[in-house]
């Protein structure tokens, strides 16, 4: 089947780094300075993309392969391939359009990145908080101290109190 | 921080008082005992005693009776022990704890 | 009182081996309210007890997941998958269930 699709598809035999070239009887070239195809059979060779201004480069293009890009430090990559920057704010803060804003009471971004989220709500499960949230941290939760213990002291319920001026018979 | 707060290393002579203070930390002082327990080599970890501060209702070990006694501040958030005719056999380590977490301990020496 | 009975007093460890520590109360510790008030604590030297599991089988918050606790009425066993270093110290167990609370007298899990 691949010999007989190579005499119907001359361009097939052509590998990733290499386009069948049309316009010299679909003889397989190399792809020109700052283009690749990373599969192989391909007619023409895809411009790299090149990592400007915000963006920087993480892997150089090759014949075979794309640059890829990620971001220069203070932001952060969105979408597939890294598609975006996005401005890195402080732990405890959000991205808003009015630039980094901190996390209202009773949120927390332990991120540069993404938004602030609501501190758990250890109630729901039956627990306490042991450590108390901040903006940069969720809370902790726990059992409470009722957990480990039925209660000693109701044992023994606290003394009444005397009235002044009566002593004790 | 959570862990409860207790007074500083105590030298006393032998038939003197001593009052160990605690504080509370990180949870509401008054809904839950606090328990205090002491540590010696001899002896390991012996529990002597529950007060909750909310109620003011006590437990202790009958080891202790007549030996410490627990009291509280609601206002300040301090639990109390207060141990009385120190000999040496009290010298020890004494804990504060509600069980989750414990003090970091008060070092009693007994001694003339 | 209940007495907690811990074996073995010593058990010495080679790192990233299983360490088992039994614990045997001298009555039931299952409560009226049917819980069972039993906990581990880990003392390393110079800290106060730090709460590893309670009421038998519950990993208090940051406790790695190698730690696990079991048994039940009087029998009771904390296990440690894999030793590693910062788990060496003094482990005690503590019942809560009856007045006064008691611990057990300890066992010192040191390198082998």
């Known amino acids: 089947f691949e010999r007989t699709r190579s005499l119907q598809d001359p361009c097939s035999n052509c590998p990733a780094g290499t386009f069948c070239d049309n316009n010299r009887n679909q003889i397989c070239s190399p792809c020109p300075p700052n283009s690749f195809s990373s599969a192989g059979g391909q007619r023409t060779c895809d411009i790299c993309r090149q990592c400007k201004g915000v963006f920087r480069t993480r892997k150089e293009c090759s014949s075979t392969s794309n640059a890829e890009c990620d971001c220069t430090p203070g932001f952060h990559c969105l979408g597939a391939g890294c598609s975006m920057c996005e401005q890195d704010c402080k732990q405890g803060q959000e991205l808003t359009k009015k630039g980094c804003k901190d996390c209202c009471f009773g949120t927390f971004n332990d991120q540069k990145r993404g938004i602030c989220r609501p501190w758990t709500n250890c109630s729901l499960d039956g627990k306490s908080v042991l450590v108390n949230g901040t903006k940069e941290r969720d809370v902790v939760c726990g059992p409470s101290p009722a957990d480990l213990s039925p209660g000693a002291s109701s044992v023994t319920p606290p003394a009444p109190a005397r009235e002044p001026g009566h002593s004790p018979q | 921080d959570v862990q409860p707060q207790q007074s500083g290393a105590e030298l006393v002579r032998p038939g003197a008082s001593v009052k160990l203070s605690c504080k509370a930390l990180?949870?509401?002082?008054?809904?839950?005992?606090m328990y205090w327990v002491r540590q010696t080599p001899v002896h390991g970890l012996e529990w002597i005693g529950a007060i909750h501060p909310g109620s003011g209702g006590t437990a202790y070990n009958q080891k202790f009776k007549g030996k410490a006694t627990l009291t509280a501040d609601k206002s300040s958030s301090t639990a109390y022990m207060e141990l009385s005719s120190l000999t040496s056999e009290d010298s020890a380590v004494y804990y504060c704890t509600e069980l989750r977490y414990w003090g970091q301990g008060t070092t009693l020496t007994v001694s003339a | 009182d209940v007495v907690m009975t811990q074996t073995p007093l010593s058990l010495p460890v080679s790192l990233g081996d299983q360490a088992s520590i039994s614990c045997r109360s001298s009555?039931?510790?299952?409560?009226?309210?049917?819980?069972?008030?039993l906990h581990w604590y880990l003392q390393k030297p110079g800290q106060s007890p730090k709460l590893l599991i309670y009421?038998?089988?519950n990993r208090f918050s940051g406790v790695p997941d190698r730690f696990s606790g079991s048994g039940s009425g009087t029998d009771f066993t904390l296990k440690i998958s894999r030793v590693e270093a910062e788990d060496l110290g003094v482990y005690f167990c503590?019942?809560?269930?009856?007045?006064?609370?008691?611990f057990g007298g300890g066992t010192k899990l040191e390198i082998k």
């Open positions: 990180g949870y509401t002082f008054t809904d839950y005992e």
């Open positions: 503590s019942q809560s269930t009856h007045v006064p609370y008691t």
């Open positions: 009421r038998v089988s």
């Open positions: 009555q039931s510790l299952v409560h009226s309210n049917g819980n069972t008030y």
